[in-house]
């Protein structure tokens, strides 16, 4: 006999990266008929919602009107049908941004390169932080972590046209509190690739520095259970 229900899906709208003092909604999607949803923050009960009527609702929303560093951290949710509780959802890392200062992002040898050239991004911030994050904007947000006293370098290695795009970086004061974003840097990669082995469908990055794909609401795929299950936002752990 089943002792627990399938885990719900958790995500943040409009994004898991929330500028301080801005609003964010944490969404938890379980099953129709769930009479209670619980949101947990850093392992403790944070909020409860009891949908009405439960048989017509399979998703609840927990609204945070004013994001700050105390609200940043790891969230999960569970739901109950009758007396039976679900497994906990994957962890959602909610990050507060626009804290303190703005880093500077640059790219060497330049913003326009030939496919196959080595490219390195540099993120610099003169205030007290030692962790930096590089994000590529778009359908899926790649996040790479780097370390350094005032500057971190992010070597992409030989680039392909898949590396084209707009990049920003952040200084990280802790796992869930990030600086203002840098000004964007648009990387253009030109040149036809003769060696197709150099042109993966998506850029490849060092496994130890790149987190999982972080799907944002712009993908329109939040409701794809299998996909969200597979792409849980566990970057920062």
């Amino acid at each position: 006999q089943q002792q627990t229900l399938p885990k719900p899906f958790i995500w943040a709208e409009p994004h898991f990266m929330v500028p301080k003092e801005k609003q964010v909604t944490i969404c938890c999607q379980g099953n129709y008929g769930a009479v209670e949803y619980q949101l947990h923050f850093e392992g403790s009960l944070f909020a409860v919602d009891r949908p009405k009527p439960p048989e017509r609702i399979n998703k609840v929303q927990f609204y945070i009107p004013d994001m700050n560093s105390r609200m940043a951290g790891q969230y999960s949710c569970i739901y109950r049908v009758g007396e039976l509780w679900s497994e906990p959802s994957n962890l959602l890392d909610l990050v507060v941004t626009e804290m303190y200062d703005t880093p500077t992002l640059s790219v060497h040898p330049g913003p326009e390169v030939i496919s196959g050239e080595k490219v390195t991004f540099y993120c610099r911030l003169d205030t007290a932080t030692s962790m930096f994050l590089l994000l590529k904007e778009g359908r899926s947000s790649h996040v790479q972590r780097g370390y350094g006293k005032v500057q971190a370098e992010f070597p992409l290695g030989p680039v392909t046209t898949a590396h084209r795009g707009t990049y920003r970086c952040f200084g990280s004061y802790n796992n869930h509190a990030w600086s203002f974003p840098s000004e964007p840097v648009k990387l253009l990669v030109t040149g036809d690739i003769e060696n197709t082995s150099l042109a993966p469908e998506d850029p490849t990055f060092p496994a130890d520095t790149w987190g999982t794909y972080l799907l944002t609401t712009e993908t329109g795929l939040q409701k794809d259970h299998a996909l969200w299950d597979h792409t849980a936002q566990n970057l920062l752990r």
Epitope: P109, G110, I114, E117
Partner: antibody, heavy 118, light 107 residues
Framework: EVQLQQSGAEVKKPGSSVKVSCKTS????????MHWVRQAPGKSLEWFGG????????SYNQKFKGRATLTVDKSSSTAYMELSSLRSEDTAVYYC???????????WGQGTTVTVSS | DIVLTQSPATLSLSPGERATLSCRAS??????LHWFQQKPHESPRLLIK???QSISGIPARFSGSGSGSDFTLTISSLEPEDFAVYYC?????????FGPGTKVDIK
């Protein structure tokens, strides 16, 4: 020691083609892109195009696209620049230059003089 | 294309004097601006990268400044071997372009 050794001077007729070589040594050829820059007599420098030996990817100055071809031979660590349909305005010194991924053109060949004259 | 304008076209100075060379870009190129020196019958030589960063082996009297669209190369005290043509180069986007050059000659 990094060295870029270019082929010798060429005298060509209008309408013909020229192929200049740039043999490299002292570094890993596939790690740096190779660019070509030309300089007409008494004039400034003009970027011709670049090629990544790693991928074969190229980028050309649109001014020369269609007439220019950049290639590499990885086995001999040599880069080539070919320019077709030559005209008198193509008379110049042609340089190969390595593009460092942390700066710009850090090493240059000695230059190859191409004279186009009927 | 990014057009680079250099001024003055010619700078006539004496050894020991300070030389200030200007380079202006037709649009903002952040700090993706490099400086080269070229002497007669020689290949260009990289002097300054990314507007202000020094190059190993280049004398400390050469320095660069600027960002966006206005850049300056300064030679603090001219040595006899510094009389040459100086080019700025756009490293921001293709086509990579060079300025027309500033000739520093002996007064």
């Amino acid at each position: 020691e990094v060295q870029l050794q270019q082929s010798g001077a060429e005298v060509k007729k209008p309408g013909s083609s020229v192929k200049v070589s740039c043999k490299t040594s002292g570094y890993t050829f596939t790690e740096y892109s190779m660019h070509w820059v030309r300089q007409a007599p008494g004039k400034s420098l003009e970027w011709f195009g670049g090629i990544s030996p790693n991928s074969g990817g190229t980028s050309y100055n649109q001014k020369f696209k269609g007439r220019a071809t950049l290639t590499v031979d990885k086995s001999s660590s040599t880069a080539y620049m070919e320019l077709s349909s030559l005209r008198s305005e193509d008379t110049a010194v042609y340089y190969c230059a390595r593009r460092d991924f942390h700066s710009s053109f850090d090493y240059w060949g000695q230059g190859t003089t191409v004279t186009v004259s009927s | 294309d990014i057009v680079l304008t250099q001024s003055p076209a010619t700078l006539s100075l004496s050894p020991g004097e300070r030389a200030t060379l200007s380079c202006r870009a037709s649009q903002s190129i952040s700090d993706y601006l490099h400086w080269f020196q070229q002497k007669p019958h020689e290949s260009p030589r990289l002097l300054i990268k990314y507007a202000s960063q020094s190059i190993s082996g280049i004398p400390a009297r050469f320095s660069g400044s600027g960002s966006g669209s206005d850049f300056t190369l300064t030679i603090s005290s001219l040595e006899p071997e510094d009389f040459a043509v100086y080019y700025c180069q756009n490293g921001h986007s293709f086509p990579l372009t060079f300025g027309p050059g500033t000739k520093v000659d002996i007064k």
